[in-house]
């Protein structure tokens, strides 16, 4: 039968009699960053090239004993995990290892610096097809870890790293702190975050996914055709990289920006019990499950969006929090959230030539978070159209007056402590789909793109008494590029998109005492790309992910 | 994930006269920065990544590294440079005294220095 | 390109031992064990066990266990196997073959026990 | 363990296909992926036409395929030709060690 861990990544419609998913990641290269490995091993035996690469320190303590299985335990089972003939994800993938781990499993920055700028020399001298470059590793925050893997992400390189095994804010640690980087946390067979003795999986904001990573079945060391089980991020990270190199291999003209997109498009939703991370970082924490596409053709039809959050501001009174999108993905909304209630709103700016998303924290808050929706919009042009707060009684609005822009997101910042306490509160124009209202003494920011084929819809969910929480979700074939709440009044938290479901979140009322009977709407705009659909049907004849991909369209409710 | 330089320990030693007029100062307002693990046990001092700036060429890193060692062994201390990087990121790898981290900061090209540090398994 | 060359045939008496070798070219060693298969006159092939040029760590047939020794020299890129305690019913062509996967056969190496 | 079955001969035309069996166990064909077949001819070394039960090594003819139902593999020669009559032998993982078939004598009737 097959591992559990295969199951679970592997679409319905590849689970025959046996685990032999088309096309097995051939045309691409995996590099391993590790122990050292027994490449002879019955299970990778011609899969991996062992370099002449090696930087580790001396291993600790005058009693410690080389014993050759030990020392290639972890990167044997990874390389299984990643390429092997019976438990492997992409069986067809070639790889290549590099020794930066001693024997007890301990490397430096240093070393892993060597080692990435090694990969990248040789992929100077002799270019090959695509490369994905697995990190199963972690140390504390590095500036220039981060610094060189984005210089070799940039260079075209996909990097996956294990979050961490610290059950801990995965920001707190590299190379999983890095933006650039493909990081994933690990569950279990019950979908569950893993525990590893009194600590487990890292969770919050840095991670994009999680995968497998409890009870792997995989290569051993201890014997050319031995098999043993393993847990932890690296494994969970293995696993992403195998399915990493099996969409490169289908699609290998596909950029880093598109392969996230689709590892999180393709992943199952909201499957995760998200009672096991701490309070505050359950919002934060991506609710995935990393899987394989349903079909080996591309996904091109569909418009990709995903959520980023940004670090918390912190609690000063001016303090503000940036969330940006990766240099090929295009801003298309931002918004903010704040535990507290007390935040100024979020708007949309440049910086750097680059559109970010900023919010603002207010007096006595305890800080924000900004919240940008990155999407994948080629031949995109947006711009971001402001309208000052208003003088009139009525609210603020503004609209995209370009000819074929359209509205793809709303945004309002204020400057007053408490928009709660300014009446009267807004009332939404009804029939406007191109334009975006709020309160009167805030500014609203309007994000207006121009993409062949691009069409939009609002569509909103009201409320009559606040409620903790009101969704409201993009119709199958449409993706949530926006999300907003009206009004912006202080007991509402802030909005965010989960998948493609717009969350307005607002203060329990029996807490705050508020008798105010006003609705809390929720915003979404809801947007498609024909252009897009044209284009994959003329490659491929049709689609064939529609129907397929119906079990991925769970909603997730925080 | 994480963009902005916070979360870890984040030493700024400002810089004041370029001490005996050995170090060229860093360009005009300016500062290196020294950076090191927060997690104490994870700390390898003695062992610094001296980054350059983002145009520095490979022949100015090797320069800068010999100008480092020359001016370490002028207030008698040994150093040791273990790699010189470039492909990835500009910059050299120093086996030295962490006595010797305000000396380095100024030289020209400096971004900033990391203290070396562990990495695991996971 | 990658080649196996055997070493020359055998004539044995029986109780004697015999060491056939097997040189490896063409492929990074260490990526691969060598396996080692037997054929007895008309009859079908017989899988004997598998050696590593990385550490030197060896995989018998249950059938060959205390009777044969499999073993390599990474310098010359050359694996052994030798069997000792010879019987007529080991004649056979001894084939050397790269890794598990066989993808690669030596040109094979009669040996002959015969009194 | 013992060896696996195949059928002790086969035969057919030129331009007809044939296909041989090679039954095993779940233990051994139907637990792992890495079902081989070689073929072999008079006094030459076994030559590999199949790996992981449907691979073709580069070189070898597309007329020759494998699959894998079960405890059961196949290996399949299409457009049956002279230069094919050989012996054909199967070949499996176990969970320590490897096994191959019987062999099977293909038989090209002229």
């Known amino acids: 039968s097959i591992p559990w861990n295969l199951e679970r990544i592997t679409p319905p419609r590849y689970r025959a009699d046996e685990y032999q998913p088309p096309d097995g990641g051939s045309l691409v290269e995996v590099y391993l960053l590790d122990t050292s490995i027994q490449s002879d091993h019955r299970e990778i035996e011609g899969r991996v090239m062992v370099t002449d690469f090696e930087n580790v320190p001396e291993e600790d303590g005058t009693r410690f004993h080389r014993q050759a299985s030990k020392c290639d335990s972890h990167g044997t089972h990874l390389a299984g995990v990643v390429s092997g003939r019976d438990a492997g994800v992409a069986k067809g993938a070639s790889m290549r290892s590099l020794r930066v781990l001693n024997c007890q499993g301990k490397g430096t920055v240093s070393g892993t610096l060597i080692g990435l700028e090694f990969i990248r020399k040789s992929q100077l001298v002799q270019p090959v097809g695509p490369l994905v470059v697995l990190l199963p590793l972690a140390g504390g925050y590095s500036r220039v870890l981060n610094a060189a893997c984005q210089r070799l992400a940039r260079a075209g390189v996909v990097l996956v790293t294990a979050a961490g095994n610290f059950r801990d804010d995965a920001c707190l640690y590299s190379p999983a702190s890095a933006p650039e980087v493909i990081t994933v946390g690990a569950t279990n067979a019950q979908d569950q975050p893993v525990t590893l003795g009194t600590l487990g999986t890292n969770f919050g904001r840095c991670v994009d996914l999680f995968a497998p990573g409890e009870d792997i079945i995989g290569a051993s060391s201890d014997c050319s055709t031995c098999f043993v089980s393993q847990s932890g991020t690296s494994q969970a990270a293995a696993h992403v990289a195998g399915i990493a190199a099996m969409m490169l291999s289908a699609e290998p003209e596909l950029t880093l920006a598109e392969l996230r997109q689709r590892l999180i498009h393709f992943s199952a939703k909201d499957v995760i019990n998200e009672a096991w991370f701490p309070e505050d970082q359950r919002v934060l924490t991506p609710n995935l499950v990393a899987a394989l596409p349903p079909s080996t053709h591309g996904a091109g039809w569909q418009l990709f969006c995903r959520t980023v959050w940004s670090a918390h501001s912190g609690p000063t009174r001016m303090a503000t929090a940036i969330a940006r999108c990766a240099p090929d993905e295009e801003l298309l909304s931002c918004s903010s959230f704040s535990r507290s209630g007390k935040r100024r709103g979020e708007r949309m700016e440049a910086q750097g030539g680059k559109l970010v998303c900023r919010a603002h924290n207010a007096f006595g808050g305890e800080g924000v978070y900004a919240i940008a929706r990155c999407c994948l919009l080629p031949q995109a042009n947006c711009s971001v159209h402001t309208a000052p707060p208003a003088e009139a009684s009525m609210g603020t609005e503004v609209h995209c007056h370009q000819q074929g822009h359209v509205l793809t997101g709303c945004s309002s910042h204020w400057e007053v402590e408490d928009l709660g306490t300014h009446k009267p509160p807004v009332l939404r124009p009804r029939g406007q789909p191109n334009q975006c209202v709020g309160h009167r003494e805030a500014s609203i920011h309007a994000s207006c793109c121009h993409a062949p084929g691009l069409e939009c819809k609002v569509k909103e969910h009201g409320i009559p008494a606040p409620q903790e929480q009101v969704t409201v979700a993009c119709e199958e074939g449409w993706t949530l590029t926006g999300c907003s709440a009206l009004p912006g009044t202080s007991h509402v938290l802030g909005a965010y998109a989960v998948d493609n479901t717009c969350v307005v979140r607002s203060r329990d009322v029996s807490t705050t005492g508020s008798t105010s009977e006003e609705a809390v709407t929720a915003v979404a705009i809801c947007c498609r790309s024909r252009h897009l659909a044209q284009a994959s049907q003329e490659l491929q004849g049709s689609s064939d992910y529609k129907d397929d991909d119906k079990h991925h369209h769970h909603h997730h409710h925080h | 994930q994480e963009d902005e330089d916070g979360d870890y320990e984040e030493l700024v030693l400002a810089l004041r006269s370029e001490e005996d007029g050995l170090a060229e100062a860093p360009e005009h307002g300016t500062t290196a920065t020294f950076h090191r693990c927060a997690k104490d046990p994870w700390r390898l001092p003695g062992t610094y990544v001296v980054v350059l700036k983002e145009e520095t060429h490979l022949s100015q890193s090797e320069r800068t590294a010999r100008r480092l060692q020359a001016q370490a062994a002028r207030r008698g201390y040994l150093t040791k440079i273990l790699h010189v990087f470039h492909g990835l990121l500009p910059g050299f790898l120093v086996k030295m005294s962490g006595d010797l981290l305000e000396l380095a900061l100024k030289l020209p090209h400096v971004d900033y220095i990391e203290e070396d540090s562990s990495v695991f398994a996971q | 390109q990658v080649q196996l060359v055997q070493s020359g045939a055998e004539v044995k008496k029986p109780g004697a031992s015999v060491k056939v070798s097997c040189k490896a070219s063409?492929?990074?060693?260490?990526?691969?064990?060598i396996s080692w298969v037997r054929q007895a006159p008309g009859q079908g092939l017989e899988w004997m066990g598998w050696?590593?040029?990385?550490?030197?760590?060896?995989n018998y047939a249950q059938k060959l266990q205390g009777r044969g020794t499999m073993t390599t020299d990474p310098s010359t890129s050359t694996a052994y196997m030798e069997l000792r305690s010879l019987r007529s019913d080991d004649t056979a062509v001894y084939y050397c073959?790269?890794?598990?996967?066989?993808?690669?056969w030596g040109q094979g190496t009669t040996v002959t026990v015969s009194s | 363990q013992s060896a696996l079955t195949q059928p002790a001969s086969v035969s057919g035309s030129p331009g007809q296909s044939i296909t041989i069996s090679c039954t095993g166990t779940?233990?051994?064909?139907?637990?792992?992926?890495?079902v081989s077949w070689y073929q072999q001819h008079p006094g030459k070394a076994p030559k590999l036409m199949i790996y992981?039960?449907?691979n073709r090594p580069s070189g070898v003819s597309n007329r020759f395929s494998g699959s894998k139902s079960g405890n059961t593999a196949s290996l399949t020669i299409s457009g049956l030709q002279a230069e094919d009559e050989a012996d054909y032998y199967c070949?499996?993982?176990?969970?320590?060690?490897?096994?191959f078939g019987g062999g099977t004598k293909l038989t090209v009737l002229q």
């Open positions: 073959a790269r890794g598990y996967g066989m993808d690669v």
């Open positions: 063409g492929y990074t060693l260490t990526s691969y064990g």
């Open positions: 050696v590593s040029f990385y550490n030197g760590n060896t």
């Open positions: 779940s233990s051994d064909v139907g637990g792992y992926n890495s």
């Open positions: 992981e039960v449907s």
């Open positions: 070949n499996s993982y176990t969970s320590t060690s490897m096994v």
